[in-house]
């Protein structure tokens, strides 16, 4: 932004500048250019020997300026365009200035003036241009400063040129008031802080409803000596509930929200929220809908799922496979997990209790993502009730639970009672028994054995009787032995694992039971 202190051309000849010597040299004249009257100060004493003609401006109030710019528009005639070349003719003039705190009026003293520069034209007006009225306009600019007094004068010294001053414009530069990145920067006088620091750092203030982002830098700009803003640093962002519209922050419209200071616009309230008011930072959930703590505010409100569908319990001897399908209503969430709980009841007494400790699940039962699980180590002659609960991220926000139950009765055999009948260095004779009432249901017995400490291999023998001799064993070696009844329904309960040791080659009649 240029703040003009003096503009000769704009004054249409009304500025009465001082000429010295009076009535000679510089002269105010009017001409017609492009059918418009223009005014100029002109001098053309090119054949009268040495010249020293001065033209002084009126006193100019400095205002806030420290450095001023002087723009001159002028024309200079070619000395060769005059007959005989006009021997004393010059093609330059001198520019001066003087500072003062008061207007000296018509009291003009050359010694008070300091030379700024010799002003020379880039283009001179030759005869053909002059005759054709082609004004060869030169534009020269000079900077003066720092200024310290209340005002100043400019003066133009003619030393024998044929020159016309068409425009004298004096101005200083300001960086204009500016909005940048939602920050307002004040109008700032363009001034170099020092020779090494040609930029003035100016702090901006965030516009209404804008803030400096958390941990970010406040807005800064640099005002150059040329009155231009450079290098923005930092920024402001529209605060929560407001969005950027051009250079301002506007409250979110009803039905929209913005939860944090950011560059993003207000978002439409998501599904299952109540309509927000103007300037909302969030949208409340409808009744029965919730937000998990980790849910972004832009996400729809959700609710707990309904119970799993079609829970089935398939008994397989001492095992049960539980299968179910996903809930019909997921509550609008993908983060569904299932929990399985187990209750056992003794048929004789009707007594019931939890059975998590005595059964074994094929995978941990409390954050299942699959829709099936196998439960083993079930006791015979026991009624089991399994509950499968569907949960999602908002289930913890309500007291009600969504589950489905399935019951199963375990009618499998009791585990066989196993003992060591005999042993040698290379064999073990094992016998077992089960209650007579259950014997009819047993199809065969499965004997599993392996060396203790050897998890990689085991042997299986099947028999219809109640005993088996395990041959080809290693002397003086402990074996792990388990017997399990096989029924039409599948595997029955297995015995506990027994440790039996073969005799050493030295021989001993002692038996380990």
């Amino acid at each position: 932004k240029e703040v003009v202190l003096l503009d000769f051309a704009a004054m249409k000849g009304e500025l009465g500048w001082l000429t010295h010597p009076y009535g000679k040299g510089w002269d105010l004249m009017q001409n017609i250019m492009d059918d418009m009257p223009i005014y100029m100060y002109s001098v053309c004493n090119v054949v009268s020997g040495d010249q020293d003609n001065w033209l002084r401006t009126n006193w100019v109030y400095r205002e806030e300026a420290e450095r001023i710019f002087i723009e001159l528009k002028f024309t200079v005639r070619d000395c060769n365009s005059f007959p005989g070349g006009a021997s004393s003719c010059k093609e330059t003039f001198n520019l001066y200035y003087a500072e003062s705190d008061v207007d000296y009026g018509t009291n003009f003293q050359k010694r008070q003036f300091t030379k700024i520069d010799t002003i020379a034209p880039d283009e001179i007006t030759v005869s053909s241009d002059f005759e054709a009225r082609n004004v060869k306009l030169n534009v020269e600019e000079r900077m003066v400063g720092p200024l310290t007094r209340k005002g100043f004068y400019l003066a133009f010294q003619d030393i024998g040129a044929c020159v016309a001053l068409l425009s004298v414009r004096v101005y200083y530069k300001k960086c204009p008031e500016m909005l940048q990145s939602l920050a307002r920067f004040p109008e700032t006088i363009a001034v170099a802080v020092s020779d090494t620091q040609p930029l003035a750092t100016v702090a901006g203030t965030c516009v209404d409803h804008a803030v400096v982002p958390y941990g970010g830098e406040g807005p800064l700009m640099h005002c150059t000596v040329d009155g231009e803003w450079l290098v923005p640093i930092g920024q402001c962002l529209c605060q929560e509930g407001y969005e950027k519209v051009e250079d301002a922050c506007r409250a979110c419209s009803p039905g929209f929200f913005k939860s944090e200071a950011s560059e993003s616009p207000c978002l439409e309230c998501p599904e299952h929220t109540l309509p927000s008011t103007e300037g909302a930072t969030s949208c409340q959930c409808e009744e029965g809908y919730f937000r998990a703590p980790e849910d972004p505010l832009s996400m729809s409100c959700t609710r707990p799922p309904s119970a799993p569908n079609y829970l089935t319990a398939i008994g397989m001897g001492a095992k049960v496979e539980l299968r179910w399908t996903a809930p019909k209503d997921t509550g609008g969430r993908q983060d569904i997990v299932y929990s399985v709980t187990c209750e056992q009841c003794w048929p004789e007494s009707g007594e019931c209790g939890p059975c998590e400790a005595s059964v074994r699940y094929s995978e941990p039962p409390h954050a299942l993502t699959r829709t099936s699980v196998t439960v083993s180590d079930l006791e015979p002659h026991m009624n089991y009730t399994f509950a499968v609960e569907a949960r999602n991220g908002v289930s913890g926000l309500v007291t009600s639970r969504s589950f489905r139950t399935a019951s199963v009765s375990i009618n499998q055999t009791e585990p066989p009672k196993v003992r060591l009948e005999d042993r040698s260095t290379t064999s073990l004779s094992v016998t077992w028994s089960i209650p007579v009432s259950q014997q009819s249901r047993v199809w065969k017995y499965e004997v599993t054995y392996r060396k203790k400490g050897d998890a990689n291999s085991y042997n299986v023998r099947r028999t219809e009787g109640f005993s088996v001799t395990l041959d080809d064993l290693a002397p003086d070696t402990t074996y792990l032995v388990q017997v399990q009844a096989l029924t039409q329904e599948g595997q029955g309960a297995g015995s506990k694992v027994h440790e039996f040791q073969t005799l050493s080659t030295e021989g001993s009649a002692n038996m380990a039971v």
Partner: antibody
Framework: EVQLLESGGGLVQPGGSLRLSCAAS????????MAWVRQAPGKGLEWVSR????????HYADSVKGRFTISRDNSKNTLYLQMNSLRAEDTAVYYC?????????????????????WGQGTLVTVSS | DIQMTQSPSSLSASVGDRVTITCRAS??????LAWYQQKPGKAPKLLIY???NLHTGVPSRFSGSGSGTEFSLTISGLQPDDFATYYC?????????FGQGTKVEIK
């Protein structure tokens, strides 16, 4: 010394035509703006037309526009005025006049010109 | 067009007198004004251009002044050779116009 010598004047009937010439010497003709100025008997001076050093631009007084044509031949150092559709009010002494910007000690040329050098004139009489 | 009005249209003066002739323009012409001298049966001669600039070879007793619409030609000490008719001419417009003339006669 600058010399301008007009010729071609004489008696002509209304509606007739005449061509005036102005022979120049003693200066560089091609540098000068040239003009015709007339003076009716016992009256003041009236500017008629002008032509630039290279043959343009040309300007005419309203009273002669469309009837008179100014021209020049720089190779012959001669200025011309072709006068057609002559009227009684065109009766006057016709002067050829010149202007050299080199002798105009001003920084910016005036909107038009004045006349530094004049010929002795030639009389044109339009009468039936 | 700009009208130029001279006054007086004629005047009688003696040798040595100071004589002033005025010229008024119908609108401002800045200083774009010339003065000419014409003797009977002769061509006009340029005296002054740009209101106050003396043409080469013109005696210094002739001077011009004024700007805008009011101009004057002054002969500071009238000489026998100065008895003639004087014309002003504006050249602020392409339709250059002359005043009607002022005749300076011997008293």
């Amino acid at each position: 010394e600058v010399q301008l010598l007009e010729s071609g004047g004489g008696l002509v009937q209304p509606g007739g035509s005449l061509r005036l010439s102005c022979a120049a010497s003693g200066f560089t003709f091609s540098h000068y703006m040239m003009a015709w100025v007339r003076q009716a008997p016992g009256k003041g001076l009236e500017w008629v037309s002008r032509i630039g050093p290279s043959g343009g631009p040309t300007h005419y007084a309203d009273s002669v526009k469309g009837r008179f044509t100014i021209s020049r031949d720089n190779s012959k150092n001669t200025l011309y005025l072709q006068m057609n559709s002559l009227r009684a009010e065109d009766t006057a002494v016709y002067y050829c006049a010149g202007y050299d910007s080199g002798y105009d000690y001003v920084a910016v040329a005036g909107p038009a010109e004045y006349f530094q050098h004049w010929g002795q004139g030639t009389l044109v009489t339009v009468s039936s | 067009d700009i009208q130029m009005t001279q006054s007086p249209s004629s005047l009688s003066a003696s040798v040595g007198d100071r004589v002033t002739i005025t010229c008024r323009a119908s609108q401002s012409i800045s200083t774009w004004l010339a003065w000419y001298q014409q003797k009977p049966g002769k061509a006009p001669k340029l005296l002054i251009y740009k209101a106050s600039n003396l043409h080469t070879g013109v005696p210094s007793r002739f001077s011009g002044s004024g700007s805008g619409t009011e101009f004057s030609l002054t002969i500071s000490g009238l000489q026998p050779d100065d008895f003639a008719t004087y014309y002003c001419q504006q050249y602020n417009q392409y339709s250059r116009t002359f005043g009607q003339g002022t005749k300076v006669e011997i008293k």
